[in-house]
Interface confidence: medium
């Protein structure tokens, strides 16, 4: 069954703070003011203890105090919700702004930034109201830390929920050449602007970015689904002139051994401006980082209508090959290769242990938690287990 790229609009489920499917043991903090304001009291809409997590130290001027939620498995986190301290309705402490940091392995932490590089998120204006923040771009994380901020010495307290879904692809990182700039009547910036890994010597590695965010580019690569972004935003692109080999090579690292049925690459084909589908794709497979590539590469030649300028998802059969690492070469068939999304259809190989530290217990694809209820700022579908939807004009 060749599924399409995952749809971020359907990935907005409560991940378990409010309904307690995230256990107390998975909620921790840098410090707590007292046991009654410990990390376990940070559940959205909960009145446990003194009604929130409150750090022991000041968050001004240093912003070092954090609340940590361990989701135990990789999730795509699309929204977060925050509240201040309940305290039987008498709480006065809340956080007007905060930052997020996240990790996929518990070792390397990344700061969340919006599409324009802004890290600080507007929080609450009072202790009781819930403020939802749509995370654009969403983050793929196992661990999430909330760092409350203040503009003066004051007490801040926090209750939170995370919304998203299990990161079913299992993709931990991709390595690719840095995207380039196409010069038309205006510059078209085809870089991976949300990549959260490292960039060294023209190569990006160790992270995820726009090629795994669920946002599929338009037929005209100069236009975008996003507001207030630059031309080319949705695509990552490379010029044939820069690759004497005639191909762009990418490597993909997964959480555990998987049997790969297919790779889906959403490509631009606006040939009047130089963008072409790849002429072919060649993928190699290996089970570990220091192991040899196994067997013959899978080769797939692409046909179809060359005169058809529609962007499209190219499906590359991978024959059920088992691996944790894939290296794929995308052959140029024209001046430019432009990709907006790459996803994989695969099955976890039974008894394969995860690549990350710790064990990941089984978790459903759709987490069991319902979306938050009775928020004036939300429009919700009538039953639990439905995605949360952020209303137009609600606070960010």
């Amino acid at each position: 069954d060749m599924k399409g790229h995952f749809d971020p609009a359907k990935c907005r489920y409560a991940l378990g703070m409010q309904d307690r499917t995230i256990p107390d043991s998975d909620i921790s903090a840098s410090s707590s003011w007292s046991d009654s304001t410990a990390a376990r009291h940070s559940r959205l809409e909960s009145s446990d203890g003194d009604g929130a997590w409150c750090p022991a130290g000041s968050v001004f001027p240093k912003e070092e105090e954090y609340l940590q939620v361990d989701l135990q498995r990789l999730h795509l986190v699309a929204l977060v919700g925050t509240q201040g301290r309940h305290a039987g309705g008498l709480g006065k402490e809340f956080s007007r702004s905060y930052r997020l940091r996240y990790s996929r392995d518990g070792r390397r932490w990344m700061g969340w930034k919006d599409r324009w590089g802004q890290e600080v998120i507007s929080g609450n204006e009072d202790p009781e109201g819930v403020v939802l923040k749509d995370l654009g771009p969403p983050m793929v994380a196992r661990l999430v830390r909330f760092y409350p901020r203040a503009d003066r010495v004051m007490s801040v307290c926090l209750r939170v929920e995370l919304y998203g879904c299990l990161w079913r692809d299992g993709l931990l990182s991709y390595t690719a050449p840095v995207g380039q700039t196409m010069y038309l009547s205006e510059a078209v910036y085809l870089n991976d602007s949300t990549y959260d890994g490292h960039t060294v010597g023209g190569l990006q590695y160790g992270g995820l970015g726009q090629l795994a965010d669920g946002v599929v580019g338009l037929d005209d690569f100069r236009k975008s689904q996003e507001l207030r972004v630059w031309p080319g935003y949705d695509y990552v692109g490379w010029s044939n002139h820069s690759f004497s080999s005639g191909y762009v090579e990418m490597e993909f690292e997964f959480d555990r051994l998987r049997a790969f049925q297919a790779m889906q690459v959403h490509c631009n084909n606006m040939h009047t401006l130089g963008a072409r589908l790849p002429g072919g794709v060649e993928c190699r497979f290996r089970r570990g980082p220091a192991m040899a590539w196994e067997g013959e590469p899978m080769r797939h030649n692409l046909g179809g209508n060359l005169g058809d300028p529609r962007a499209r998802a190219v499906s590359v059969p991978l024959g059920g090959r088992v691996a944790r690492f894939l290296q794929c070469r995308f052959l140029f068939a024209g001046p430019w290769l432009l990709f907006s999304e790459i996803s994989f259809i695969s099955d976890v190989v039974n008894n394969s242990s995860p690549a990350l530290g710790g064990t990941f217990p089984p978790a459903p694809w759709w987490p069991p938690g319902p979306p938050p209820t009775n928020f004036s700022s939300l429009e919700l579908e009538p039953r639990g287990q439905q995605p949360v939807a952020k209303a137009e004009g609600s606070p960010t």
């Epitope: 060749m2 037929d219 046909g303 209508n305």
Partner: antibody, heavy 117, light 107 residues
Amino acid sequence: QVQLKESGPGLVAPSQSLSITCTVSGFSLTSYHIHWVRQPPGKGLEWLVVIWSDGSTTYNSALKSRLSISKDNSKSQVFLKMNSLQTDDTAIYYCARTGNFYAMDYWGQGTSVTVSS
Amino acid sequence: SIVMTQTPKFLLVSAGDRVTITCKASQSVSNDVVWYQQKPGQSPKLLIYYASSRYTGVPDRFTGSGYGTDFTFTISTVQAEDLAVYFCQQDYSSPYTFGGGTKLEIR
């Protein structure tokens, strides 16, 4: 909201030509592509032609010599012309849009064309 | 041009039944297959694109699968409002040909 509406003559004499207009609203012809598809009475669908957002065209080769397609982006209109009509060209003619799903996601209600003397 | 052979031509089913329609392409069309529903007196409506991706708002009882030359469209639990003709179409190479259609009738 997205809408497409076909308008045509209804009745055409054999060997005459047919002109149909598709007027769209709710989206721009500079960003989306418009196809023409026809359906003879009680039969299946036949794809005729597409005009891409940039104005380029792709025709069904079996009908290419009799078809021409054009558009006016500013008026949000697409025009189909078909020459030398015969009775087996009697059909409902639909215009449809393709956007970001590589498929025809919105269709007009169709205009019925009867070729008869 | 690519020929899309759709079977069966007619299906007579009861509400609650599971229905499967197949489409076979005369050559590989990757996963560029689309399924449409056309109710009596109406224009076609998009249900499935890229062989298996459900279009926005389409109930999850409608599913598609397949790759290359063989494609399947399934209605898991037929409802009375599913009375319609269903068409497959290859969107791989022009001319973008349709299957002959399957008329679904409810007992």
